[in-house]
């Protein structure tokens, strides 16, 4: 009888062990463990009757196609073999074991007691069958084993072969290579590449097989198992393998497909091949006059650029524009994209105007193209370039006027300072209640009128100021304070004031500049009280243009101590005093108690303990402080009231040759206008110089050395 | 054309707050100032404060500073005056003024418990 | 703060004759910037608000009677009505503006 085993291990005996089995007895013994697993058997007793080869009593082991052993006796001789220690190892999972005794025994046998066992496969040590052992990588384990792959490799579906991922390779430049993968190691199994070139319409691809060729072939059947094949359009060439590479191939096509093919199996190297696009040739090309073509080849081909570019000082001229550079391509029948465009040489044209200044032409007729020279200069006396610029610009190549210092930037002209039209009287002696100026010997006087249209009626007033540049007025604080009901200090609004410069005779306003503020600034620190700090400034909303009858005064150095003591300066003022005046009659000036024409007077600066004295004497609170110095005489006089509110107190200074404002006419009094020992109270400007350049945004360096030339 | 009408009366408790309003047209409100002045029964007249428009600068009497605040909202043209911490003695009829020349018809305030 | 007092407190004058009204103030009105003194006078009836007949000491609003007329200086002005009319009974108040505005007391005028 057949007796049926599907454990992982157990035991077999002969039947009625220990005792004697009994005679003509069979017994099969099918002994089956899972896939992965091979059984190992051996004996813990063995006492079989003895026989030639066997053939009485016997335990034959076998698998279903081969007997493995046969064993009988007790002990191993030349014609019967006992199993002893002997292991006996199953190739797959199933053993089937098999007893049997024949009719008769001559003695007592006691028979045989087996155990069995399922042992582990190691599949990956095992397996010689390429077709069935992992390609790169085993993995063992109890009952199995699995394959893996390299990086870049994917496992086949046959979960042996690796093969890569290659079907979408795009190649788009005009020259390449293409190998296969991994290649100058074995390609991998079980795959399909696909390489596809495309380039441009009109380029045609060459490919060259290079160094190593070697793909798995047939010596009968022409590429059964790997191969290439190169597609061009409907027609297909190959396929290729072997060791001998394919010729060359001219495909006559932009747009090319190549197909590998791997099996399962074998170990090639592969192959690898570049690939080249050539296109039609061009006509020679010839360089423009003052030009050059880069770059500079014998011949070109289907998309070769050349940019043709000109010498220095010479631009490329195409179609009536002017470019730096000029590309030109070889199209794919052959011919050029464009002609040659010409060279011409760069023109800077006509440079720009210079506020100010003028232009002169230092080349012949007026050139205005490479390396022409042109000078730039001010409207003098009335500006002077800034840091004595020469002027001289060039046409450079780049077609922009260049000067060495300032670039591609114009000079600038800066308004001269303190030079009037007519030379102002500086030793002319006292001038008892003034005199008239003669148009021009106080370009800087500006009347400050202002018209607070938030009251009303509206408030008007007004004073003096001094032009500082040909946008700056300087002036008192007092004069462009809002008169607010308080004693807060806020500035008038910049809408309710108008500038008058070049004002001669208040009569006729025809020749004079009249300018809206744009800024009207007061110093920050202006005191109501005391008026200490009394200066201001108005920025116009406008530039006025310089002439004889318009122009800035100089700016003192910075000096705490002010004017010297007794130094002799001049103020001049329409000499508008009169408490019941309206500012309309002055701009219209249609009354008599005023003076028509703009007045002058010299004064002497009064020593500060003097005039500090004279002011301390008085009944009420005034302080002279280190920020006002005063002017006039002992003995007073009608002059000292002259000058209206926020008016320069000029001094000539000997060393730049310039008149300086170094006061502006801030306060006097509380006695009636030119009473004795009733000094005028100016502002000291050269404690302010820092702050005046500062609102005015230039540095002080930039006009500083007009004063101290 | 040019005037400056005020809100109507009020009858407020002592300690409450009260706002007159006051619309301007006819000019440029903006650029002028509007001044406020009370008048209480049978007194003369007190000046209050002032307020630009189209900066919103103000001027305070002292004896207001703490209680009044004027405001404006130029997009109605219309100025405003706010009496906080009402006494009995506030009782006035309160005017807003064109800087000197315009008067409002006035505004009674009544305080009274 | 500067203090504006009037006098008298009140004056009765006959119709056509002339009326005087007097306001000094504890400081000088005269602005030295603006050149302008900042005295303003007033009048005003029962029932409506002041109306303004006089500013910067001197100068008479436009579509007041030439009647009415201010002078003065410094710190002592005067209001004159030259010849009284009977629309002219009210209370008349001088305002300085030199500072934060204040009034004086007022003038009551009536007919005699």
């Known amino acids: 009888h057949t007796v049926e085993l599907n454990n992982m291990f157990g035991q077999i005996q002969s039947p009625g062990y220990p005792d004697s089995y009994p005679s003509d007895s069979e017994v099969t013994w099918n002994i089956t463990v899972p896939d992965g697993f091979r059984i190992k058997l051996y004996f813990m007793h063995f006492n079989l009757e003895s026989s030639y080869l066997c053939e009485y009593d016997y335990v034959k082991v076998e698998t279903e196609d081969q007997v493995l052993a046969t064993f009988c006796g007790r002990e191993t001789t030349d014609t019967e073999q006992t199993p002893g220690q002997e292991v006996v190892l199953s190739p797959g999972s199933f053993m089937s074991i098999t007893f049997r005794s024949d009719f008769s025994n001559e003695e007592r046998f006691t028979g045989f007691d087996a155990h069995y066992m399922a042992v582990d496969v190691d599949e990956c040590k095992e397996r010689e069958d390429e077709e069935l052992s992992c390609d790169h990588y085993c993995h063992n384990y109890i009952g199995g084993y699995y394959c893996s792959c390299r990086f870049g490799y994917i496992l086949h579906t046959d979960n042996r072969t690796c093969r890569v991922e290659c079907s979408d390779n795009l190649f788009t430049q005009r020259t390449g290579v293409i190998t296969s993968p991994d290649f100058p190691n074995p390609y991998p199994k079980s795959s399909e590449c696909l390489y596809t070139i495309e380039l441009e319409e009109g380029f045609m691809v060459n490919l060259q097989f290079e160094d190593i060729f070697d793909i798995e072939d047939h010596p009968e059947v022409p590429c059964p198992y790997d191969y290439i094949k190169i597609k061009v359009g409907p027609k297909v060439l190959g396929p290729f393998c072997g060791e001998k590479a394919p010729e060359p191939i001219s495909t006559q096509s932009h747009s090319v497909l190549i197909l590998f093919h791997s099996d399962n199996s074998g170990e090639n190297r592969g192959w690898r091949l570049s690939y080249r696009a050539a296109g039609n040739e061009c006509p020679e090309l010839q360089p423009p006059v003052h030009g050059k073509i880069e770059p500079s080849q014998a011949k070109y081909f289907f998309k070769d650029q050349v940019l043709v570019s000109c010498d220095t000082g010479y631009k490329v001229l195409k179609d009536n524009v002017e470019m730096d550079t000029f590309q030109i391509e070889c199209l794919k029948d052959g011919t050029w994209s464009n002609k040659i465009p010409t060279c011409k040489i760069v023109d800077c044209r006509a440079p720009g105007e210079l506020e100010h200044g003028l232009i002169t032409f230092s080349t012949r007729n007026n050139l205005t193209t490479y390396k022409s020279e042109i000078k730039y200069s001010c409207q003098e006396p009335y500006y002077k370039m800034l840091n004595n610029n020469t002027g001289i610009y060039t046409c450079s190549a780049q077609g922009v006027w260049m000067n060495k210092v300032l670039g591609r930037s114009l000079p600038t002209c800066l308004p001269e300072c303190g030079q009037p039209s007519r030379s102002l009287p500086s030793l002319v002696k006292r001038i008892i209640g003034g005199r008239n100026a003669e148009p021009g010997l106080f370009p800087w006087q500006a009347l400050i009128v202002v018209e607070d249209t938030s009251r009303v009626p509206n408030d008007k007033w007004f004073g003096s100021g001094a032009l500082l540049s040909a946008s700056w007025i300087l002036t008192a604080a007092h004069v462009l304070r809002s008169q607010r009901r308080d004693t807060t200090v806020i500035p008038v609004s910049k809408e309710h004031v108008t500038v008058y410069l070049g004002l001669h005779d208040v009569r006729d306003k025809s020749g004079a500049v009249n300018s809206s503020a744009a800024r009207v600034v007061l110093h920050p620190d202006f005191n109501i009280q005391n008026y200490n700090h009394d200066i201001a400034l108005v920025q116009l909303q406008e530039p006025v243009p310089l002439g004889p009858h318009v122009m800035p005064v100089c700016l003192p150095r910075l000096e705490p101590e002010g004017p010297a003591p007794h130094m002799l300066g001049l103020v001049a003022g329409w000499g508008i005093s009169n408490p019941n005046v309206t500012v309309d009659e002055i701009i219209s000036s249609g009354t008599r108690t005023l003076s028509d024409v703009l007045q002058y007077v010299k004064l002497p600066v009064v020593p500060h303990a003097e005039c500090k004295t004279s002011y301390e004497s008085r009944s009420g609170n005034y302080s002279v402080t280190e920020n006002m110095f005063c002017a006039g005489y002992y003995e007073g006089g009608k002059d000292t009231c002259l000058g209206d509110s926020g008016g320069a107190f000029v001094i000539f200074d000997d060393l730049s040759q310039r008149w300086v404002v170094q006061g502006l006419v801030s306060w006097g009094g509380p006695e009636e206008c030119g009473s004795k020992q009733v000094y005028g109270v100016y502002t000291k400007v050269s404690n302010y110089v820092d702050w005046v350049w500062e609102q005015m945004g230039l540095p002080q360096s930039v006009v500083e050395p007009q004063v101290e030339r | 054309q040019v005037q400056l009408v005020q809100s109507g009366a009020e009858v407020k408790k002592p300690g409450a707050s009260v706002k007159v309003s006051c619309k301007a047209s006819?000019?440029?409100?903006?650029?002028?100032?509007i001044e406020w002045v009370r008048q209480a029964p049978g007194q003369g007249l007190e000046w209050m404060g002032e307020?630009?428009?189209?900066?919103?600068?103000?001027d305070y009497n002292e004896r207001f500073k703490d209680r009044a605040t004027f405001t404006a909202d130029t997009s109605t043209s219309t100025a405003y005056m706010e009496l906080s911490s009402l006494r009995s003695e506030d009782t006035a009829v309160y005017y807003c003024?064109?800087?000197?020349?315009?008067w409002g018809q006035g505004t009674l305030v009544t305080v009274s418990s | 703060d500067i203090v504006m007092t009037q006098s008298p407190d009140s004056l009765a004058v006959s119709l056509g004759e002339r009326a005087t009204i007097n306001c000094k103030s504890s400081?000088?009105?005269?602005?030295?910037?603006?050149?302008?003194?900042?005295l303003a006078w007033y009048q005003q009836k029962p029932g409506q608000p002041p109306k303004l007949l006089i500013y910067?000491?001197?100068t008479r609003e436009s579509g007041v009677p030439d009647r009415f007329s201010g002078s003065g200086s410094g710190t002592d002005f005067t209001l004159t009505i030259s010849s009284l009319q009977a629309e002219d009974v009210a209370v008349y108040y001088c305002?300085?503006?030199?500072?934060?505005?204040?009034f004086g007391g007022g003038t009551k005028v009536e007919i005699k």
């Open positions: 003024v064109r800087s000197e020349d315009l």
């Open positions: 305002k300085q503006s030199y500072t934060l505005p204040t």
């Open positions: 307020i630009l428009p189209g900066s919103g600068s103000t």
């Open positions: 910067w000491a001197s």
């Open positions: 006819g000019y440029t409100f903006t650029g002028k100032w």
């Open positions: 400081q000088s009105l005269l602005n030295s910037v603006t050149r302008k003194t900042y």
